[in-house]
Structure formats: C-alpha cells, structure tokens
Interface confidence: low
C-alpha cells in the first residue's frame, strides 16, 4: 500500500504526540551528544513539515523517504564535525548509505555524565512547571544513553514515568511514593535496553535467519497451541518490527508493532488463551503485555517428535525440498514441547539436527546415519542444567554480592585484558542471575538463567567491539550467537596474560567512599578486586578473600573515625603493604 507521502502516512497513523516522541527518540539515538534544546528544535521543524504534508501530500518534498527527510535534518546540525568527528562524513553520502553510516556510529557507551536524580521536590516542581518538556527530557536522556532502546517500548516507559509523577507529586510523602517507582523504572529500563540490544545484535551481526530462528523458538514456547503457520506469520511480522527499530526506522516500527498487537488480539483464539487480559488494555500497555505474556499450556497428547523427524522415511526428502521450513517445523515442534529449555539450547539442538541431516542425507544409508540424532542432544541439555545447578548452589551459599565477586574473579582470569569498568558491570549483571532465576522451580530455571546470560554477555560483546582488546572475547562473540555462553564458560585462565604493574594509586581510597550508597560502595570494592586479580592472576580464592575482608574492615573503620581522611591515608598505606605481602606482589 504505497503512500504518496510516507511522513504524512506515519503522522496520521501515529498521531502528533507519538510522532513527535518517536522522532525525538530517533534523533537522540543518532546524535547522542547534541543538547536537548537542539533536538527539540529539529523535532518541531520536522513536525511542522509533516503537518504540511498531511494537508497536501503533493506538497514539495513530501514524497521523500523518511531516511532522506530525517537525514537531511540531522545534517543541518552546525557543530556536527566538531562534536562527532568522522560521523560528519555520513552527510556526504546518499541514502541508504547515509543512514547505514549513522547506524554505524551509534555508541553503546557514550561519554555522557551519569544521570543524577535531583531532590523529589525539585523534580515535582519541574514536572508541574512544564510537564511536556519534563517528559521529553526523559525520552531524550534515555534514548541518547541507550541508542538501541526499543522505541515503542520507551513510549510505554514514559507513560509510566508520567503516571508516577502525576500520582506521587500530590502524595503526603512524595519521596516514599515516587522513589521506589523510579527505581523500578530504572531497573526495568536497563533490562529492556539490554534485551533489545541483543535482538539488534542478532539481526545486524548474524542476520535475519538467526533472529527468525530465535523468534520461532520463543513464540513456540509461548504459544504452543498455535499452528506452525500462525507462528511463522507472527515471526515474519515480529522480524519486520525489530528490523525497523534496529535500523532506526522508528515510525514504521511503532506503527507495525501496533498492527501486530491488533492482529494478535483479533486472532487470540488461534494463538493463546493467555492474551485476554492484555488485549483489553490501551495500545502501549497491550503491546508490552503481549511481549511479556506467560507461556500458554501445552496441548495434551502431543505425539513423539521421533516419528516425523527421525523415523519417517521422508526426512531427507522433506529437508531437501525446503530446508529452512523443515528446520523451522523441527524447532517449532521441539520448542512447544519444551518450555523448560532456554531458547539458546533449543537453537543448539536445531543446529545439531541440521548438521546431522546435512551429513546424513548425503550418506549411503541416511536413516542409519541419523537414527541416533536425538542421543546427541543429551549432553547439550545436561551442560546448562549442571552449570545452573552448580551456580545456584554457589549463589545460595554466598548471597548476591559475594556471588558477583566470585564471577568477577572468574571472568577477570578468563579475559583480563577487558577494561575494569566493563568487567565490573558485566560480572555484577551476571551475578544478578542468582536472585533473578535461582528462586524458580527447576522447570523455569534454565529459560530464565541461560537466556538472561545471553543478554548480559551481549553487553560484553557490544562494549568490547567498540575497543577490542581480547581475541578470546572476539572469538566467543562472533563465532556463534547461540554458543556464546558455552564459549565463555569453557574459557580457562588466560595463561598468556602479562600481569599489570602494581600501582598504589589504584588502591588509594578517600573519605568520599563513606557517603556513597551501598551499591556504589560495592562497585568501588569490586573495582579494587578486579584490579587485584589483574595484578595477581594466580592469586587463590583464599588470598583474595583475605584481602577483600581486610579492605571491607578498613573502609568500615575509617568511615567511623573522627578524622576520616587521615585514617584513609594512614590505614590505607598499611592495607596496601599488607595486601602486597599477602599476595606476594
């Protein structure tokens, strides 16, 4: 359905409010360093132009593509070269290369100041003074720090953000009402950003086929009563939505996501019995709810998979006729029977099945060759099961903070070249798998844990890609999307690593640590732990534990002292000397 004016089409479909919000998100995700006011000006100009096209689709430039219109607008920014350097070269290109160029320059770790939360009264005053600007600022700050944030979902977050301020700024105890809500939005937002980053990495680095395979597995688990054709249709539509969002086509993405939600709700009888509540909600809530909906019950009496995929004499014929369709059916059938498996495990099984058919369908006796293919699945299933069992036991024994520390040591020894802030961030997130997943019963542990670990390890991969320092990380990140976690798990201590020179400055602490929040204090201690391991990669657990216990005691003692700064200076020197002795530095 070709439209004379794409910009008018999207403006009419989305409405002015969503149109403006999505254009702001798009611009902030591309030009992450630009001041808020500059972006608002650009958005207003685009919006005014869109309105002229709504009034007359034949008006000048209204027939231009959105990439052309938006790219032209971004390229009017006066300080492009000073602020962004070589990104300015993108403006010399034509579409679609110009957009590809902008995408290439998205920065997963932009050099932006940490967002500091003002006092509640200050925030409430700002909210009341100019609600529209306040909410736009929220979209802008999140979008520029998370350049792949799923735009239609960010609109949902903004709606909840607004609701929190509307409710809490008139509450008796504003802080008690507001702060927990903001904490929840922050944590959910970080998780949402990381999940979407994996989808975009999957599409951009491993291609549409990889993403579609992931989607077949996940949707088949979620909608096990749906027919394969129905799941295939949903996968095709979902792939289009995420391809658009990951490609910066946010207006099309939001529009198509709304269409998909509409389709799912109109056809819920043939999709899932769990959608009823979601489908009664307004659009943004509806789409979010569908994306998070629990798995439907498995149909009763599903036949054994072996009949169609091992015992049938037509296996090779069916495979040869339409390889991806046949493998898709295998993945669908396996996934709908196994909500207890992680998506990445299901994809490993499908890959093993594919490899076996590739080999066996060319053999003299194909059936004899692939007859035992399901036996090859056993070790693949047991590996994550055992790993999760061991790590949940360790988590239950240590608690989250010390479990994170164990992972910090483990991962620093595996890939010591990686920057300390990245190791701390990634290991802390890996450690959260314990409190997130170990509470679940056995049947839900693996999909929770391994699919969460895929998201966290992708953070490591995208951060490392910006400044690659470790061949081992590059190898695990690029060889196979579904084997990233087993690849990292299999890494041993890097014997080629030359320990870092000891630098006392790294272990010098000041009284400001005493005023930090518990989380910030943990991060300081964990940063020191990573640095210790980088200095002494062969240090034993016991040695590191002793040093960290001494360090915790030192911080506690000096934070209670009358003259804190003197205590940190004098006791700090003693701690460094004692640590050097303990570790033989």
């Amino acid at each position: 359905d070709a439209h004379k004016s794409e910009v008018a089409h999207r403006f009419k479909d989305l409405g002015e409010e969503n149109f403006k919000a999505l254009v702001l998100i798009a611009f902030a995700q591309y030009l992450q360093q630009c001041p808020f006011e500059d972006h608002v000006k650009l958005v207003n100009e685009v919006t005014e132009f869109a309105k002229t096209c709504v009034a007359d689709e034949s008006a000048e430039n209204c027939d231009k593509s959105l990439h052309t219109l938006f790219g032209d607008k971004l390229c009017t920014v006066a300080t492009l070269r000073e602020t962004y350097g070589e990104m300015a070269d993108c403006c010399a290109k034509q579409e679609p290369e110009r957009n590809e160029c902008f995408l290439q320059h998205k920065d997963d770790n932009p050099n932006l100041p940490r967002l500091v939360r003002p006092e509640v009264d200050v925030m409430c005053t700002a909210f009341h003074d100019n609600e529209e600007t306040f909410l736009k600022k929220y979209l802008y700050e999140i979008a520029r720090r998370h350049p792949y944030f799923y735009a239609p979902e960010l609109l949902f977050f903004a709606k909840r953000y607004k609701a929190a301020f509307t409710e809490c700024c008139q509450a008796a105890d504003k802080a008690a009402c507001l702060l927990p809500k903001l904490d929840e939005l922050r944590d959910e937002g970080k998780a949402s950003s990381a999940k979407q980053r994996l989808k975009c990495a999957s599409l951009q680095k491993f291609g549409e086929r990889a993403f579609k395979a992931w989607a077949v597995a996940r949707l088949s688990q979620r909608f096990p009563k749906a027919e394969f054709a129905e799941v295939s249709k949903l996968v095709t539509d979902l792939t289009k939505v995420h391809t658009e969002c990951c490609h910066g086509d946010l207006l099309e993405c939001a529009d198509d996501r709304a269409d998909l939600a509409k389709y799912i709700c109109e056809n819920q009888d043939s999709i899932s019995s769990k959608l009823k509540e979601c489908c009664e909600k307004p659009l943004l809530e509806k789409s979010h709810c569908i994306a998070e909906v629990e798995n439907d019950e498995m149909p009763a009496d599903l036949p054994s998979l072996a009949a169609d995929f091992v015992e049938s004499k037509d296996v090779c014929k069916n495979y040869a006729e339409a390889k991806d369709v046949f493998l898709g059916m295998f993945l669908y059938e396996y996934a709908r029977r196994h909500p207890d498996y992680s998506v990445v495990l299901l994809l490993r099984l499908a890959k093993t099945y594919e490899t076996t058919l590739e080999k066996c369908c060319a053999a003299a006796d194909p059936h004899e060759c692939y007859a035992k293919v399901f036996d090859e699945f056993k070790p693949l299933v047991e590996e994550p099961q055992n790993l999760i069992k061991q790590n949940c036991e360790l988590f239950e024994q240590l608690g989250e903070y010390k479990f994170q520390n164990a992972l910090l040591v483990r991962y620093t020894k595996k890939v010591p070249q990686v920057s300390t802030p990245t190791l701390v961030e990634v290991s802390r997130n890996l450690g959260k798998v314990g409190s997130k997943c170990c509470k679940h019963p056995e049947a839900k542990r693996m999909p929770c844990a391994e699919d969460y670990l895929s998201v966290v390890l992708n953070q490591l991969c995208v951060l490392h890609e910006k400044t690659p320092v470790s061949d081992r990380v590059t190898k695990c990140c690029t060889e196979s999307l579904v084997n990233r976690r087993p690849c990292f798990s299999a890494l041993e201590v890097d014997e080629t690593y030359v320990p870092k020179e000891f630098n006392a400055e790294t272990f010098t602490f000041h009284a400001d640590i005493c005023t930090l929040s518990e989380k910030e204090r943990q991060i300081k201690k964990q940063t020191a732990l990573v640095e210790l391991v980088k200095h002494k990669p062969k240090a034993t657990k016991e040695q590191l534990k002793a040093v960290m216990d001494d360090f915790a005691a030192f911080v506690e003692k000096c934070c209670k002292a009358d003259d804190k700064e003197t205590c940190f200076a004098e006791e700090g020197k003693k701690l460094v000397a004692a640590s050097q002795a303990a570790l033989g530095l």
Partner: nanobody, 116 residues
Framework: QVQLVESGGGLVQPGGSLRLSCAAS????????MSWVRQAPGKGFEWVSS????????RYSDSVKGRFTISRDNARNTLYLQMNSLKPEDTAVYYC?????????SGQGTQVTVSS
Amino acid sequence: QVQLVESGGGLVQPGGSLRLSCAASGFTFRGFGMSWVRQAPGKGFEWVSSINSGGEDTRYSDSVKGRFTISRDNARNTLYLQMNSLKPEDTAVYYCAIGGAGATPSGQGTQVTVSS
C-alpha cells in the same frame, strides 16, 4: 582466531574487470552475512555490498549497482566480488567484513587502482 584475507586487486584500465576473493577462517563462515567495504585514499570506509549467510539475498550501494556482483562459496569459506565496468572513482582498498552494511573490516584489504 578470526581471519579474513582479501586478494585479487590490481591495476586495471577504466571499463575493465577484476574479481576479488576473501578467504575466511576461524569462524563458522556459512552462518554469517558478509560485506565488502572500501576506503579511497584520504576517505572513510564506504559500504559496497552485502550478502546473507545463504547467499540468496544481496545488496549494493547505489554507486556500484549493476556493475558489481557479490557471491559466496560456503563450501570453500570464500566471499567474492566481481567488479565490471570499473571507473577511476572505484580506486580504493577493498576489505571484506563479517556482517551487514554496518560491518567493520579486520583484514589487510586488497588495493584496486583504476587508471588509464
């Protein structure tokens, strides 16, 4: 260790042809989309063409459309770029890279010079 080794470049007259190859090792070649990108003297990287893992989906920049053809041989772990009707503005170092249009090259590249 991921390795991409480009070859096949050289000096050619305008209107001439060249076929570039990229030998891949250290990763599962058949599972990855691949691209060719180029860098002209004193310029940034420019995306030229991409092909998906199966080889059935190919894309080209406007500047080479109709003249260049990307292909791959998954059995040989090799990516190709057939370049016909070459122009002086095609002069550049050509690199192959893992991934789509946003891919970053990691090999040494192969020099293509189009000049009479």
